[in-house]
């Protein structure tokens, strides 16, 4: 079945049951997510606006899907497996009486079960498992997942130690002057340079030594972590950010509504599932998209791909490739290409590398 293809997952509580205090609902849902994050590499964060991966809804009867609730008793809640749109969303029947204790229906216990579905688990045949299909109250203070629940979720996501295989295990800020530091995406934004890595970005103001680190979510709460490509069209005050097969448009540092959109709207063939790097050249009014060992050229005026693409990176950018992590445009004549912990200053007029640097050379390391 489907799984989330990322380890940082957002949730939003769309509305609150009147049966409980808001703080108790928040706490029950947070603790329910924590049950699963304790045994996996997954990290959950609550957002209050925008599109979350998992939407938590209290509703009664018909409520916007094919699975209308049935009044008190019977079906308590349901949740959709991982995916976009309704994928991951957890719906709780408002006709139940939701509680923090053993009376009525315990929200925490029900939420643990439903979040299991949101993460891709099916029902268990083990009566001791939280994923067993029928509700049974257990003491929430001593509640633990069963061995079957843990086996199931770890078969999908691995155990918490697998965090260590991720670039940034504990969600902490990567060391800026680590000589092995690489970046996910880099772009100019006006007179600043944004360097993206995991859920962080560094801001470098041109010609100033000081840099500051920020959470992507602190500037743009609706954007995901792990931005993979970015480019700026300064004349339009636009920045485009890419992750997987989606992109977001930022205008005047504000996310535009109606995003994300599919990268295929640029004209990429269906086999392109993500963009590695992108850069806009204002001299030619073209954007270069780098995907694996190839690149496409997009005409921003005509809003269409130029004919004759893709081309091999190594063929047309001497000394660069076969793949790149990030690229940005600067000083009217240079592309700065990032490959792992190395960076190449490339003069696009002379069509050659003019300098080799460490990726973090911009930070005075």
């Amino acid at each position: 079945g489907p799984v989330w293809r990322k380890h940082y997952i957002t949730y939003r509580i769309n509305n609150y049951t009147p049966d409980m205090n808001r703080e108790d609902v928040d706490y029950a849902i947070r603790k329910a997510f924590q049950v699963w994050s304790n045994v996996t590499p997954l990290k959950f964060s609550k957002i209050n606006t925008g599109m979350a991966d998992i939407l938590v809804v209290f509703a009664r009867g018909a409520h916007g899907d094919f699975h209308a609730f049935d009044g008190k008793g019977g079906i308590l809640a349901h949740a959709f497996g991982p995916g976009s749109g309704i994928g991951g969303d957890a719906h709780f029947d408002e006709d139940e009486f939701w509680t923090t204790h053993s009376g009525g229906t315990n929200l925490f216990l029900t939420a643990v079960h439903e979040i299991g579905h949101s993460l891709g688990l099916g029902h268990s045949s083990d009566p001791k498992a939280v994923m067993f299909p029928t509700y049974k109250y257990v003491d929430i203070n001593t509640f633990r997942l069963s061995a079957d629940d843990i086996r199931g979720i770890q078969s999908l996501y691995g155990d918490p130690k697998e965090n260590q295989r991720l670039p940034n295990p504990d969600n902490s800020e990567p060391a800026l002057c680590d000589p092995n530091l690489s970046f996910d995406a880099v772009t100019t934004v006006g007179n600043k340079i944004f360097f993206f890595k995991d859920r962080f970005f560094w801001l470098k103001v041109s010609e100033r030594p000081k840099t500051s680190v920020n959470l992507i979510s602190s500037l743009w709460p609706t954007l995901p972590s792990g931005i993979e490509a970015a480019y700026e069209i300064e004349a339009r005050n636009q920045v485009f950010l890419f992750k997987d097969d989606k992109y977001w448009l930022i205008s005047n540092l504000r996310p535009e509504p109606n995003y994300p959109k599919s990268i295929h709207s640029f004209g990429f063939p269906n086999f392109v599932k993500k963009i590695d790097a992108a850069v806009f050249n204002p001299r030619f009014y073209r954007t270069y998209f780098f995907v694996d060992n190839q690149y496409w050229r997009y005409d921003e005026r005509r809003q269409m791909m130029d004919p004759g693409y893709p081309k091999l990176i190594t063929k047309n950018f001497q000394g660069i490739g076969p793949k790149i992590d990030a690229v940005f445009y600067s000083k009217n004549k240079y592309y700065y290409f990032f490959q792992g912990s190395n960076q190449f200053e490339y003069d696009f007029l002379l069509q050659r590398i003019t300098k080799t640097l460490k990726s973090n050379s911009w930070f005075g390391c």
């Epitope: 079945g1 489907p2 916007g64 899907d65 094919f66 959709f80 995916g83 749109g85 309704i86």
Partner: antibody, heavy 122, light 103 residues
């Protein structure tokens, strides 16, 4: 390439029966909800019925409940709609549609067949 | 039961125009709204899902917005191939359709 090919339509008298089939190819059929949607001549779209991946959960529009039966054969990658007690108002093009989801239906149809015409007339 | 009301039922516009079609639910459906395009004699095709997400391969001139009860489909600059009928849909309920014709 995902393909859904409906068959079994035709002319039938009121009160008669017809069985529609939808042959699926180009994707793994068994994990997805599948649906029938119809369109009367010159009219809009009307959802008719849906079936869960295992076939254990079926849903029907009120207008066809008790007369139509949806089923599937995952070994043959085929969806069926058995239509009994047909009425003139059942005249329509019947489309088979694939849901994007498994365990619960999202009601989001990402692929459709070309449709088969059912005419109920004496 | 949930009902969807789509407006207008028909619309005349010219190539290059910006066009907006609206869909209203009689109760909150969160962002669980999809838009389809249907050309004469053809099956419907998914354009927008979850209110604002563009289906793969659909041109970026199409966009969707809204949540709760009010939703819109916008075509930023009409192309000749966009003249068709558009339906909003939520689970088993479709809007009545909007026929977009050449002025």
């Amino acid at each position: 390439e995902v393909q859904l090919l409906e068959s079994g339509g035709g002319l039938v008298q009121p009160g008669g029966s017809l069985r529609l089939s939808c042959a699926a190819s180009g994707f793994t059929f068994s994990p997805y909800w599948m649906h029938w949607v119809r369109q009367a001549p010159g009219k809009g779209l009307e959802w008719v019925s849906g079936i869960s991946p295992s076939g254990g959960n079926t849903l029907y529009a009120d207008s066809v409940k008790g007369r139509f039966t949806i089923s599937r054969d995952n070994s043959k990658n085929t969806l069926y709609l058995q239509m009994n007690s047909l009425r003139a108002e059942d005249t329509a093009v019947y489309y088979c549609a694939k849901d994007i989801r498994g365990a619960y239906s999202s009601g989001l149809f990402d692929y459709w067949g070309r449709g088969t015409l059912v005419t109920v007339s004496s | 039961d949930i009902q969807m009301t789509q407006s207008p039922s028909s619309l005349s516009a010219s190539v290059g125009d910006r066009v907006t079609i609206t869909c209203r639910a009689n109760q909150s459906i969160y962002t669980y709204l999809n838009w389809y395009q249907q050309k004469p004699g053809k099956a419907p095709e998914l354009l927008i899902y979850a209110a604002s997400s563009l289906q793969s391969g659909v041109p970026s001139r199409f966009s969707g917005s809204g949540s709760g009860t009010d939703f819109t489909l916008t075509i930023s600059s009409l192309q000749p191939e966009d003249f068709a009928t558009y339906y909003c849909q939520q689970a088993g309920i479709f809007g009545q359709g909007t026929k977009l014709e050449i002025k």
